[in-house]
């Protein structure tokens, strides 16, 4: 078919025969080769493979292949090797992104923040504040905020409400007589109606681009209140009505129940800036890891809507 034939046509180039001064039209050499001898009135051009360390990407009429770029400077790694058909391409290794001709570590989203946008080899991670009903209890450059464990769905009660930095802590009630047994949908452990679990003071880091107005915005991570409680992945406890007990009160004879480890990469939906988005304007120096400072209250939250 004509179309196929056309697609196989080799381009041509013009060459001036030095001996005769005649302008000749020669066939180009394929990519990965160069013209080692030009055509004459009586002979075709001769193509040779590009020597090691050189390349040609396209069919050509050149007498020498292009030199490959210099070896990748540390900490960059080769994305494409230097070969007859390709120049060497450098990129940043996993966990880093290209910044000012070098590689910088992806920002670590602090406790209370999750990844809104994954980092790539060319773009930094974007962090977001964990929104209502979600939390992040480990600094990470890959994990999103996770929904609180749903204690009620497991026939448990909330012993300690979640914050943006910690999951709900679920437990069992002691056996009550039927007359005192709580009705479904009633929160056994609750906080004042006006208080959101995210309002509970807690220490937290401020990721790059999320500078706090406070002078010392970073904070050290506190150990979990109950180390045996693992991260839950079921959503928030506020689906039941809250009573008026003080936030710090706990019920007598409650038993803590270990939650099974759930998926780690829950995303949060943030509707407004944080609906799922994260840190934007970043300082030139990404956070390489958590910095230590003074404890402070929760950071901001975002209209957040991501989840797995």
């Amino acid at each position: 078919q004509p179309e196929q034939k056309a697609s196989n046509l080799i381009g041509t180039y013009r060459h001036v025969d030095r001996a005769t001064g005649q302008v000749l039209t020669c066939d180009k050499c394929p990519a990965g080769t160069y013209v080692s001898e030009h055509c004459t009135n009586t002979s075709l051009r001769v193509c040779s493979s590009c020597p090691v360390g050189t390349f040609t990407r396209h069919e050509n009429g050149i007498e020498k292949c292009h030199d490959c770029s210099q070896p990748c400077p540390w900490p960059m790694i080769e994305k494409l090797p230097c070969a007859a058909l390709t120049d060497r391409e450098c990129t940043c290794p996993p966990g880093m992104f290209q910044s000012n001709a070098t590689c910088a570590p992806h920002t670590v989203c602090p406790v209370g923040w999750g990844v809104r946008k994954k980092g790539t080899e060319t773009e930094d991670v974007r962090c977001k504040q964990c929104a209502r009903g979600t939390f992040s209890d480990v600094p990470s450059s890959v994990m999103k905020c996770k929904a609180y464990t749903d204690c009620l769905s497991q026939n448990l009660v909330v012993i300690k409400p979640g914050t943006k930095e910690a999951d709900n802590v679920c437990g069992t009630l002691p056996s009550f007589s039927s007359s005192t047994s709580p009705s479904p949908g009633t929160a056994i452990f609750s906080r004042p109606e006006h208080m959101d679990s995210h309002e509970v003071p807690s220490s937290t880091y401020v990721p790059k681009g999320m500078n706090s107005t406070e002078s010392n915005s970073s904070a050290s991570v506190r150990p979990k209140v109950l180390s045996s409680i693992q991260e839950g992945t079921v959503p928030d406890n506020t689906s039941s009505a809250r009573g008026k007990e003080d936030v710090n009160k706990t019920l007598p004879n409650l038993q803590v129940v270990n939650h099974q480890q759930g998926p780690h990469h829950r995303h949060i939906l943030k509707l407004l800036p944080s609906m799922e988005a994260t840190g934007g304007e970043k300082s030139s120096t990404p956070i390489k890891g958590p910095k230590r400072g003074h404890p402070r209250q929760n950071l901001h939250k975002h209209f957040d809507i991501n989840e797995h």
Partner: antibody, heavy 115, light 110 residues
């Protein structure tokens, strides 16, 4: 009790400017992301812009990018939306909302862009 | 046109069960939490469901949310006259890098 109170709406000509404010009370304002969402007459909700608690990051809908600026003053517990180069299609009730989950909303302020 | 698709209207008689769907894609609902808002006539929207299926305190348990794949649903059981309102779903969109709302569903109690 969480309260958000918008103000600053009104009638403005195309190309004109307005500055909306949202006064917050009943919660620690500086801990929360805040957003603006609008609703044109008889239409649905449209997210406009958001800002982190510290003001460190801002996001804008494509429809307002370059014309609107969101900001906040945590010392005054107030969120702002500076609207420039207003167009007829910006006519709407503008709501401010708290948190990434938009768990609390103000009552809204009407912005009318008309000649 | 909204990134999230909702039916424009739904209706039922008192006591009936009504379901509102919200259809999206992998970049939004498929990979993010879904939120639902109720807007009673002449009032501001109110958070009804967050993180797919959680109710804020004060929201009756007649309202329930669920999510499966790239779609979400809001169910209202035991429909009441006071449930007559507009309902909006919302989520984050990874591709747009922005929050998105559904077009809204007007629920009428017959």
């Amino acid at each position: 009790e969480v309260q958000l109170l918008e103000s600053g709406g009104g009638l403005v000509q195309p190309g004109g400017s307005l500055r909306l404010s949202c006064a917050a009370s009943g919660f620690t304002f500086s801990n929360y992301e805040m957003s603006w969402v609008r609703q044109a007459p008889g239409k649905g909700l449209e997210w406009v812009s958001s800002i982190y608690s510290s003001g460190g990051e801002t996001l804008y809908a494509d429809s307002v990018k370059g014309r609107f600026t969101i900001s906040r003053d945590n010392s005054k517990n107030t969120l702002y939306l500076q609207m420039n180069s207003l167009r007829a299609e910006d006519t709407a009730v503008y709501y401010c909302a708290r948190d990434g989950a938009a768990d609390y909303w103000g009552q809204g302020t009407l912005v009318t862009v008309s000649s | 046109q909204s990134e999230l698709t909702q039916p424009p209207s739904a209706s039922g008689t008192p006591g009936q069960w009504v379901t509102i769907s919200c259809s999206g894609s992998t970049s939004n609902i498929g990979n993010n939490y879904v939120y639902w808002y109720q807007q009673l006539p002449g009032t501001a929207p109110k958070l009804l469901i967050y993180t797919n299926n959680q109710r804020p305190s004060g929201v009756p348990d007649r309202f329930s949310g669920s999510k499966s794949g790239t779609s979400a649903s809001l169910a209202i059981s035991g429909l009441r006259s006071e449930d007559e309102a507009d309902y909006y779903c919302a989520t984050w969109d990874d591709s747009l890098y922005a929050p998105v709302f559904g077009g809204g569903t007007k629920v009428t109690v017959l």
